[in-house]
Amino acid sequence: EAHKSEIAHRYNDLGEQHFKGLVLIAFSQYLQKCSYDEHAKLVQEVTDFAKTCVADESAANCDKSLHTLFGDKLCAIPNLRENYGELADCCTKQEPERNECFLQHKDDNPSLPPFERPEAEAMCTSFKENPTTFMGHYLHEVARRHPYFYAPELLYYAEQYNEILTQCCAEADKESCLTPKLDGVKEKALVSSVRQRMKCSSMQKFGERAFKAWAVARLSQTFPNADFAEITKLATDLTKVNKECCHGDLLECADDRAELAKYMCENQATISSKLQTCCDKPLLKKAHCLSEVEHDTMPADLPAIAADFVEDQEVCKNYAEAKDVFLGTFLYEYSRRHPDYSVSLLLRLAKKYEATLEKCCAEANPPACYGTVLAEFQPLVEEPKNLVKTNCDLYEKLGEYGFQNAILVRYTQKAPQVSTPTLVEAARNLGRVGTKCCTLPEDQRLPCVEDYLSAILNRVCLLHEKTPVSEHVTKCCSGSLVERRPCFSALTVDETYVPKEFKAETFTFHSDICTLPEKEKQIKKQTALAELVKHKPKATAEQLKTVMDDFAQFLDTCCKAADKDTCFSTEGPNLVTRCKDALA
């Protein structure tokens, strides 16, 4: 239904707290360099204006679209051109082009320092002094570093943060209470960020149809007792919510997500038997819980699908009459039978089925042509299953750090032109798949591994798009989203690469490494490992292990030495010489 004032409508629906949080996220995601104070001032102005519209929907400018109102605010910021360069050109455009322009200038890798967590006492002091400002800072800092973070979900993480601080700041040992809990929230939020970025990439590159197919597969796996009409309705609504968030329409997105959660809870009987626990929670927790609710129990006696999709004489007729509905039904029926497959795999199977029908329904004898289509799925299914087995076996043998190193070597060989920081970040993230997925029950491993890897590789593609350097990466990133992971897995050593010359300074370390936290030490060592592979792309695993063991021993010795600086300056060059010899 149309409202006289869109801003008043959203303010009323969302309430002041969520309204302000979402506006802050929107501004922080669009203008990523502005300070918290600058954004907080804008948010207050927008909120005050919204309140005037709530009081009188006919007041001046209350009928303007949210894009117009927000865009005008952003464009009124002083020194926009000095701070943001060509993004200022967006302000010369009219809506909707202006908003599209802002979206195109979102930076997936902004040059901002890492978000450092203050020490416990300082955190608790500022939290107690002003919880609202403290949470505002959290939203601002996360949103500007993750310009596609799912806004209503970021409000959920802020709420978690708030609850942890409320609990831990009352304890004697604040540090040991806060650290593990906040680390847990950070890890979950980072995974949420890459997953959502993947959804927005799907929407941006391949449109709503691609996202809706993803949603049908995912929802059919989770709700195998819901009928196709119900799954289609949920997928359509979920597509709208994600389209809005990916498009910067955060107030609409959060409002529609709340509506979808309400609908699901009012229709549990036709959706799933597992929703009640989620539905008993308050809004943000409820929507989060529904998004990762456990799969409902599969129906006991689902028949094979060959009868409807291969053996039926009307297959081509049914397909021709309503292609998307027929393919949607196929995807639904296949997915509800296979919660043990990744969504990416299910979409590859549906794509293969579609390609087969396109080809066969144009032939003289279609049934003879498409009769073997389901059997032809076997290699597509076996490939990711083998990937999971091989990688989980390796993870179990090496542990997380060793597994990351194995991936780092593999990916540096595949794409040695990619910058070392990007390779290290990618390998560390890809390596976490072991800890995240390999400990799960067998039927949950494949969906966990492949869908997580796909999301991480999407980030690799986004970073590479900014500065394309590797033909291998460009090739894998240009294809369809669901083919990316198999494409990257199939890459081998890049034979076109001319090895980097050996630079001693790349492998020269100083005593300051000794005081770094363990994570930073690992990154330094992994940076050296990637550089070694760039110098010798065809080095064997044994050679690289020898060098890395020697390197670890060197760090251990010098960091324990009485005179660390002398140890580093005398033993360092010897290490470099030994490395060169080992790789010769």
Epitope: H295, T297, M298, A300, D301, L302, P303, A304, I305, A306, V310, E333, Y334, R337, H338, P339, D340, L374, A375, F377, Q378, V381, E382, P441, D443
Partner: nanobody, 115 residues
């Protein structure tokens, strides 16, 4: 060609136990359902127990608490442990394994419960 072979049937006294096994030979992949059905003389074939790919189990009301279905994924095997057997459990028991492409049935194994 996929073949299913059931074993473990036989004659047992009321209150006794049997363990049925079913093994699949040939290339069957992408299994999403394994089940045991039974057919008593003059009656329709009925589902006794099934186990889906996610590990969910389903039992007919008449066997709940007495029968347990389990599987060994690596060997494509499915088992039915039957305890506290009754005369009305007498039937031919069939194993059924399903993937999206088809429904594969064994020849059946006779279970007779009689004193």
């Amino acid at each position: 060609q996929v073949q299913l072979v059931e074993s473990g049937g036989g004659l047992v006294q009321p209150g006794g136990s049997l363990r049925l096994s079913c093994s699949a030979s040939g290339s069957i992949w992408g299994i999403y359902h394994m089940g045991w059905y039974r057919q008593a003389p003059g009656k329709q074939r009925e589902l006794v127990a099934s186990i889906t790919v996610d590990g969910s189990t389903h039992y007919a009301d008449t066997v709940k608490g007495r029968f347990t279905i389990s599987r060994d994924n690596s060997k494509n095997m499915v088992y039915l442990q039957m305890n506290s057997l009754r005369a009305e459990d007498t039937a031919v028991y069939y194993c059924d394994i399903r993937n999206v492409g088809g429904d594969y049935w064994g020849q059946g194994t006779q279970v007779t419960v009689s004193s």
